[in-house]
Amino acid sequence: RTTTCFGDGCQNTASRCKNGGTWDGLKCQCPNLYYGELCEEVVSSIDIGPPETISAQMELTVTVTSVKFTEELKNHSSQEFQEFKQTFTEQMNIVYSGIPEYVGVNITKLRLGSVVVEHDVLLRTKYTPEYKTVLDNATEVVKEKITKVTTQQIMINDICSDMMCFNTTGTQVQNITVTQYDPEEDCRKMAKEYGDYFVVEYRDQKPYCISPCEPGFSVSKNCNLGKCQMSLSGPQCLCVTTETHWYSGETCNQGTQKSLVYGHHHHHH
């Protein structure tokens, strides 16, 4: 956030940029957390926009019995590997076709034992606060589907009638990795020393990292005619003085008419 300065006071302003702000010849360039002419004000909202999608990766091993292993399958650029990859991908696309989160498979290694296929099943979902549950459910369905297909599509009399056949006992799930996204943690980190006062609130399933000085949220502090300002001790209302009133109180809700005070003082003296 930047504030431009014109005139004689500018050089003076340059040495007074606060909170890590830097002078660029015209204005104080403020770090993310601050704004104002001298970077003296703390922002009331921080952009922690979530990623559009969250991914998960399942490390699986299956044993394909309908292809005889050859050394060429170890070479990822060989004709044999490329063809195996194409057929395996097509088969897995059929297996997982009912899973909306399914993106595809990635073969990491082929090794001897019929053909042992070490691969990743890739899952993706749109970000919502429930993304963990969505991906956990998807990984369970993947396990169910791969277990089912490797039990059903088996060699009979040393021949396969399906696109691919499997060894029922060769199916293993090694590891499941879900991209971590924790808006509360991100919010705390980005708010730095003000982390205790910033909270995450959701609107249309999107997280907003806000302090009570940001209006329009359930935690928003109502300063009435005053101005909410963040300090290291938390949000505070700076009350205003108008031509006719002084305002005071924690939320600037107590107005005192100047004329009454002056009248009283005048009368007193």
Epitope: T65, S66, V67, K68, T70, E72, S78, Q79, E80, E83, F84, Q86, T87, E90, M155, D158, I159, C160, S161, D162, M163, M164, C165
Partner: nanobody, 124 residues
């Protein structure tokens, strides 16, 4: 890429013989799988026989065992199907298929490379 060219089809009386050929090109290895499939009108494509070109395996459908013989000439990269004691139910379009893998599946979806068909008609 792998290319297949099938030939040798024709019309024959029941009990007669035919020999189908399928020339292959584009392989980087001399060890792969080749197969003959057939498709009669209104029916699904079915396997007739397959062979590994290293001689490691041959397979025949029950309906053709003892009458049809699959073979491969490595020097010519050509697949053959010797068809003897032909029956009217052998009438179909015959296709050769190939894979760079040593396949043990009779499902046509597992075979990526296909030649154009050659018609075999057996009349009684």
């Amino acid at each position: 890429d792998v290319q297949l060219q099938a030939s040798g089809g024709g019309s024959v009386q029941a009990g007669g013989s035919l020999r189908l050929s399928c020339a292959a090109s584009g392989y980087t290895s001399n060890r792969y799988s080749m197969a003959w499939f057939r498709q009669a009108p209104g029916k699904e494509r079915e396997v007739v026989a397959f062979i590994w070109t290293d001689g490691g395996r041959t397979y025949y459908a029950d309906s053709v065992k003892g009458r049809l013989t699959i073979s491969h000439d490595n020097a010519k990269n050509t697949l053959y199907l010797q068809m003897d004691s032909l029956k009217p139910e052998d009438t179909a379009m015959y296709y050769c298929a190939a894979s760079s893998l040593l396949l043990q599946t009779i499902n046509p979806r597992a075979w990526p490379y296909w030649g154009q068909g050659t018609q075999v008609t057996v009349s009684s």
